[in-house]
């Protein structure tokens, strides 16, 4: 089993390992599959991909059958199998079977802390970001330990590249000093920022 | 002489399952992907599905997904095709061919009746 | 989905005769993927022609079969009683794979 690694967003080149002269593609099937469903196949020099695939796939039959996916989705994760089948006395014979695995990586950055003073109040807000992850993350807010509660936390996720934005805002009051930490997971991944408030000087030291 | 002999007809209460099985001979089914086909009665050819007995890889036809569940057991060389939740517009005769240019070989086919 | 039409969906001609089967593709596909089968009532469905115009095994000459792209004919040049059958075309060149809806022959 072959393994390819890619960041989402990014092309990824699965090769079937195999290759067959034009002369022979008229006595030839072959079928990409991604566990057990259908991604491309061909028959006989007929082309076609399924809806999932269509725009973004690009057959390569000169460079061993190789299927080339654009923009990288996370669903694009797994086990894909190439199978090619020739034509020999009165049937299609397995001449062929590779199978493939391609991880798609979409880590989060270091979420941004951006923070506003709330007018005629000892009140400041901080608000927490980022976006371009998977899976889908959980924000949490932390001082010396223990989490506290956001104002709101919004998640969303962008249908077309699959990938996920989180913004969380937090009130905090500004006459003590305060260390914050910003925590998204996702998967078993992690990232964070840490939001530092000095009252003697009345500015904010972030993390970086 | 490649044949391929269907279980017999059955007659089925709707809601209920059927499964009929697909043996050939002169022929190992795990080197050949086996179709199944339906046809409801005075009605046209249909196909359902397929399935690569080596790996148990199956294709359908969406309208079948859900309905046909396609499997094979090399061990006996047998393909089969189960048809759950059973409904009268199931009533059909279904066959079993050979993965080929085209089907040159098809089970003798096997009806099957969903009456209450 | 590729759909497949047939026409006529049935017609009576006399021993004989010259027939022809017309199959119109709703997308276009190698001629290589392109089949047709004769069946009789109760019986499976029999190869005739595949790849558009090579006759299956044991099929008389007087079947033919012709077209490209998106327009296919069978032909049967001198109208047998035994060709009284329902005649389908069906493409391989894309899942789902379909047939035609079927040409019912029948002798005056």
């Known amino acids: 089993v072959i393994h390819v690694t890619k960041e989402v967003k990014e092309v990824a080149t699965l090769s079937c390992g195999h290759n067959v002269s034009v002369e022979e593609l008229a006595q030839t099937r072959i079928y990409w599959q991604k566990e057990k469903k259908m991604v491309l196949t061909m028959m006989s020099g007929d082309m076609n991909i399924w809806p999932e695939y269509k725009n973004r796939t690009i057959f390569d039959i000169t460079n061993n059958l190789s299927i080339v996916i654009l923009a990288l989705r996370p669903s694009d994760e797994g086990t894909y199998e190439c199978v090619v089948l020739k034509y020999e006395k009165d049937a299609f014979k397995r001449e062929h079977l590779a199978e493939v695995t391609l991880s798609v990586k979409a880590d989060f950055p270091t979420p941004s802390i951006s923070d506003f003073e709330i007018p005629t109040s000892n009140i400041r807000r901080i608000i927490c970001s980022t976006s371009g992850g998977f899976p889908e993350p959980h924000l949490s807010w932390l001082e010396n330990g223990e989490e506290l509660n956001a104002i709101n936390t919004t998640v969303s996720q962008d249908p077309e590249t699959e990938l996920y934005a989180v913004s969380s805002k937090l009130d905090f009051n500004m006459t003590t000093n305060h260390s914050f930490m910003c925590l998204i997971k996702y998967g078993h991944l992690r990232v964070n920022q840490t939001f530092n408030w000095n009252t003697t000087k009345q500015e904010h030291f972030p993390d970086n | 002489e490649v044949q391929l002999v269907q279980s017999g007809a059955e007659v089925k209460k709707p809601g209920a399952s059927v499964k009929v099985s697909c043996k050939p001979s002169?022929?190992?089914?795990?080197?050949?992907?086996m179709h199944w086909v339906r046809q409801a009665p005075g009605q046209g050819l249909e196909w359902i599905g397929w399935i690569d007995p080596e790996n148990g890889n199956t294709l359908y036809d969406p309208k079948f997904q859900g309905k046909a569940t396609i499997t094979a057991d090399t061990s006996t060389s047998t393909a089969y095709m189960e048809l759950s939740s059973l409904r009268s517009e199931d009533t059909a005769v279904y066959y079993c061919?050979?993965?080929?240019?085209?089907?040159?070989?098809w089970g003798q086919g096997t009806l099957v009746t969903v009456s209450s | 989905d590729i759909q497949m039409t047939q026409s006529p969906s049935s017609l009576s001609a006399s021993v004989g005769d010259r027939v022809t089967i017309t199959c119109s593709v709703s997308?276009?596909?190698?001629?290589?993927?392109l089949h047709w089968y004769q069946q009789k009532p109760g019986k499976a469905p029999k190869p005739l022609i595949y790849g558009t115009s090579n006759l299956a095994s044991g099929v008389p000459s007087r079947f033919s079969g012709s077209g490209s792209g998106t327009d296919y004919t069978l032909t049967i040049s001198s109208l047998q009683p035994e060709d009284v059958a329902t005649y389908y075309c069906q493409q391989w060149s894309s899942y789902p794979l379909t047939f035609g809806q079927g040409t019912k022959v029948e002798i005056k």
């Open positions: 061919a050979r993965e080929g240019l085209f089907f040159a070989y």
């Open positions: 997308s276009s596909i190698s001629s290589s993927n």
């Open positions: 002169g022929f190992n089914i795990k080197d050949y992907y």
